[in-house]
Interface confidence: low
Amino acid sequence: TQHGIRLPLRSGLGGAPLGLRLPRETDEEPEEPGRRGSFVEMVDNLRGKSGQGYYVEMTVGSPPQTLNILVDTGSSNFAVGAAPHPFLHRYYQRQLSSTYRDLRKGVYVPYTQGKWEGELGTDLVSIPHGPNVTVRANIAAITESDKFFINGSNWEGILGLAYAEIARPDDSLEPFFDSLVKQTHVPNLFSLQLCGAGFPLNQSEVLASVGGSMIIGGIDHSLYTGSLWYTPIRREWYYEVIIVRVEINGQDLKMDCKEYNYDKSIVDSGTTNLRLPKKVFEAAVKSIKAASSTEKFPDGFWLGEQLVCWQAGTTPWNIFPVISLYLMGEVTNQSFRITILPQQYLRPVEDVATSQDDCYKFAISQSSTGTVMGAVIMEGFYVVFDRARKRIGFAVSACHVHDEFRTAAVEGPFVTLDMEDCGYNIPQTDESTLMT
């Protein structure tokens, strides 16, 4: 989870589930692996925006202390601010919780830029607008950090939803979702609908606006249109998937598909951008530049350093191409594609200089750690993290930003041969680095 572009990011002892409340009864029969249908209590439970992350309200301790927690599918620790910090309005006060248990162990998590460190413990945790349960989970109490918390983001901690393999300090620290599933009847599945506004939000607008939904334990049909298409989770560490083809406005990038997944491809709600391996990024930008050549943009724009502005309401969406990523399907030699619009990969920013223009940053950037399908991709889709069946589902989000001419799409099936060859096998050295 990288800082700046990657939101700063990089878990429950199987203790007795004190205060356990069973899930609410529903009028539908549960359907494995997760309940499907209406999850009214969880819809609209996220706030935030792609540049600073999406967060859910959680409570920790007894009596409950309410905190806003960043939802991060690119890490596996539940970590919360536990000491005063200039960017935090509130923090977890362990001494006020009668159910806190100290694990007498520290944790240190460095990033390329910045870090956090803290003390491990367990406590009772619940999600007010989530399943009606309380679980005892591992918590990293952050006592010191650098370039981790974001001024004005309104979140005080991070919920790492990936697998134990990438938990810090090691894979013995059970992640929150594992604890939740073990201690309750919540099915081993969650789904995310991240809703980009399509325009910059100021602080009060973010607080007042809806940012999306995290449905824990199921799938809500009201959050997507069309069909859900599933891609296998290649390996349970990050949410790793395999991209088999990339097109810009329908034109194949024609690269060896291994390049698309070098050294991995992950789905990460804690990263802002679509991040692509160097070679892929260069080819993609060349193709996007060619497609949008009716207007000339400064080099700094393509590097994500400089914004471009148009008079309010005049953004020429039509000159920018759509981008399609083909993902390995569940059936042999079958793939499907997800297609995003410039409304997803041009990120609206509040221009420091004027409110008269609509200004954007190019939200595709270069990566040295593989492809990262961050918030700009996820904002186009309803994404189902079906851990029980080791697969990730994509459908067109009911809240994605589009225009009257084009819409995001999830389409298939397509015949694609030798897709297994598209996966990159990382040499077996120490993979537990967060220095990405």
Epitope: K296, F297, P298, G300, F301, E305, Q306, L307, V308, C309, W310, Q311, A312, V349, D351, V352, A353, T354, Q356, D357, C359, K361
Partner: nanobody
């Protein structure tokens, strides 16, 4: 390439006024124009800046020493920026430079010379008492 050309400098009595112009060419997208000055034996310092955006003049920024006396504005053609200097003082005597930089998201502090990468040749302003 971006080119900047200042004009309008000259000599004036204390309390008088001058209007400097900066003609910019070569920018196709949003950018900042700043006015800086350098008095003999002193470091170059920021005076005022304005964001030039597609729809017209954006936010303006002023050094404390000139607030209320100087006004920066954009001309109708979008390629000219004016610095209207009123209530001039002898300490305003300096060579005045026009400078430009891309308008990027990480924009502060705006009135530091190091933030600007395109510079004009300068125009002399002399204020006598």
């Amino acid at each position: 390439d971006v080119q900047l050309q200042e004009s309008g400098g000259g000599s004036v009595q204390a309390g008088g006024s001058l209007r400097l112009s900066c003609a910019a060419s070569g920018y196709s997208y949003s950018y900042y124009i700043g006015w800086f000055r350098q008095a003999p034996g002193k470091e170059r310092e920021g005076v005022a800046a304005i964001a030039i955006v597609n729809s017209g003049g954006g936010r303006t920024y002023y050094a404390d020493s000139v607030k209320g006396r100087f006004t920066i504005s954009q001309g109708n053609d979008k390629n000219t920026v004016y610095l209207q200097m009123n209530s001039l003082k002898p300490e305003d005597t300096a060579i005045y430079y026009c400078a430009a930089r891309s308008l990027s998201w990480y924009s502060h502090p705006l009135l530091q010379p190091s933030q600007f990468n395109n510079w004009g040749q300068g125009t002399q302003v002399t204020v006598s008492s």
